[in-house]
Interface confidence: low
């Protein structure tokens, strides 16, 4: 039997699938039908976007051979796509902080301001989330020094 938390998640899952297969959902008279399965702009304030961002930056830090943690300076663009789960597409500017990787990754670490240690990177992340399973995967990650 679905518990108090699982029931709404199950409904969300059913809704997501229904939206994904509905060919003209969200269309209005005089406008071409918009495929709900296509990417749409998302707000950085959304909890799902925040979680996806934290996950992607965490993976970036794990993979980088940098002495320091990086964190988001700004999210340039956020989009999401409802599929069997949710694809998040995030364009993010990252900055190197003064926190080393031997320290916990603190969200409020200040950014380096010394010219020889300052570093920015621009990254495009694609994160696949299945909220009702609590899983996230970094499907794509491309970064370049900014």
């Amino acid at each position: 039997m679905a518990g108090p938390l699982r029931a709404p998640l199950l409904l969300l899952a059913i809704l997501a699938v229904a939206l994904a297969v509905s060919p003209a959902a969200g269309s209005s008279p005089g406008k071409p039908p918009r495929l709900v399965g296509g990417p749409m702009d998302a707000s950085v304030e959304e909890e799902g976007v925040r979680r996806a961002l934290d996950f992607a930056v965490g993976e970036y830090n794990k993979a980088s051979n940098d002495m320091y943690h990086s964190r988001a300076l700004q999210v340039v663009r956020a989009r999401k796509q409802i599929v069997a789960g949710v694809n998040y597409f995030l364009d993010v500017e990252l900055g190197r902080t003064t926190c080393t990787k031997t320290q916990p990754n603190l969200d409020n670490c200040p950014f380096h301001d010394q010219p020889h240690l300052k570093r920015k990177a621009f990254c495009s992340f694609q994160i696949y989330a299945v909220p009702w399973q609590g899983t996230m995967t970094l499907s794509k990650s491309t970064c370049q020094d900014a």
């Epitope: 051979n65 940098d66 002495m67 010219p115 020889h116 240690l117 300052k118 570093r119 020094d145």
Partner: nanobody, 114 residues
Framework: DVQLQASGGGLVQPGGSLRLSCAVS????????MAWYRQPPEKRRELVAL???????SYADSVKDRFTISRDNIQRTLYLQMNSLKPEDTAVYYC?????????WGKGTHVTVS
Amino acid sequence: DVQLQASGGGLVQPGGSLRLSCAVSGTNFRLNDMAWYRQPPEKRRELVALITGGGNTSYADSVKDRFTISRDNIQRTLYLQMNSLKPEDTAVYYCTTQRSGRQYWGKGTHVTVS
């Protein structure tokens, strides 16, 4: 250009000690944060210890109280004193520094604890 040359690795028994050195040229050593990384076989490279230009140190939990990072600004050399070595410390050890947004790596020295 920045050059780093690590040395001092070798084969040692569990519980033994080694001291790694890293000679640095081509940068203002005194101002640079320096670090030792290691890459165990088949694993990701990981940060072991870091020392700032001001001499503050920071260690990975796995080596705390066993390893000591230090620097000699006159000799322009970075050190890693490794005591109470364990088989899981087996890895290639690299010294590294950052300058102008770039990270520079030494060639690496092999440490085998067996």
